[in-house]
Amino acid sequence: RQQWELQGDRRCQSQLERANLRPCEQHLMQKIQRDEDSYGRDPYSPSQDPYSPSPYDRRGAGSSQHQERCCNELNEFENNQRCMCEALQQIMENQSDRLQGRQQEQQFKRELRNLPQQCGLRAPQRCDLEVESGGRDRY
């Protein structure tokens, strides 16, 4: 069994290396940016709309194109739930230092958890996406 797990890990590792998860990152960032531009940024000050809506993010087409490409990539992990989770964790890790607020991080995490379902794929049952804002100190 240990041998099988080792092979499974290796197979997952090579799948992750081959996969291009950027479209997923782009899709998710556009999605949460659009939501925030629409509803204002700070849920604690509803009277304040720190960032006004912007036509820049109303494109939609670009985002759906990213989503389609993202789903194609995630499809590769359909038969390996643990590997699907690792792909989601990698997306979280890659974007965590862009998210400098708890709300932004939670929203990104929510969208990320829903991603497999949006793609018509099974979502991993248990998948820990915890990373504090800023991820690891990369600089």
């Epitope: 950027r22 990152e25 782009q26 998710l28 960032m29 556009q30 940016q33 925030e36 940024r41 700070d42 604690y44 000050s45 720190p50 960032y51 912007s54 820049y56 990213h66 890659n94 974007q95 862009r98 998210l99 400098q100 607020g101 708890r102 709300q103 932004q104 504090e132 804002s133 800023g134 991820g135 690891r136 100190d137 600089y139």
Partner: antibody, heavy 118, light 111 residues
Amino acid sequence: EVQLVESGGGLVQPGGSLRLSCAASGFAFNDYTMHWVRQAPGKGLEWVSAISYGGTNKYYADSVKGRFTISRDNSKNTLYLQMNSLRAEDTAVYYCAKDSGYRSLLHWGQGTLVTVSS
Amino acid sequence: EIVLTQSPATLSLSPGERATLSCRSSQSLVHRNGYNYLDWYQQKPGQAPRLLIYMASKRASGVPARFSGSGSGTDFTLTISSLEPEDSALYYCMQALQTWTFGGGTKLEIK
């Protein structure tokens, strides 16, 4: 309304220490990355340091690394900058700023002046 | 370290004219998520800076429509379509791709 009030500035001799504070109100302080930015008299803006909302991640400009320490007390809604081994070139107005959540400096305090001179 | 170079250092124009401020980065500011991590800030004498534009082209709330940001990669522009007397100020670009760094600033004078 978001308010950021800096304090702790003053005159200090080269080699001395100073601790700046920034009292925050009007938003959920423990939900945002916070920054220190400085501006020497008649000069441009220089980003100094930042700290993530839980305090786990700390970032510093090369010019202050090893001398300055950023910290926060989320129970007191306060941001700090401990400045050691101060030099004449650290003389500046120090601003504290709140991150938008996406790495932009959305709200700023009015600043506190630090003068390093003998 | 990413270095931002702003030009011109000083710009002197009349009310109603169009102002074009430039910011050039020593490396691309496009993140893998597709966004350009470049902001523009305005600072008037004796005041704290104010965010005008974030992520290269998005206008912060309360910022008049005459302010717009454009560019991608290493070359960015802040345009003020029709200058008002109150636009007289210092303008800074700031990158947020790798930690944070400001450009040297452009002083905009209204004749």
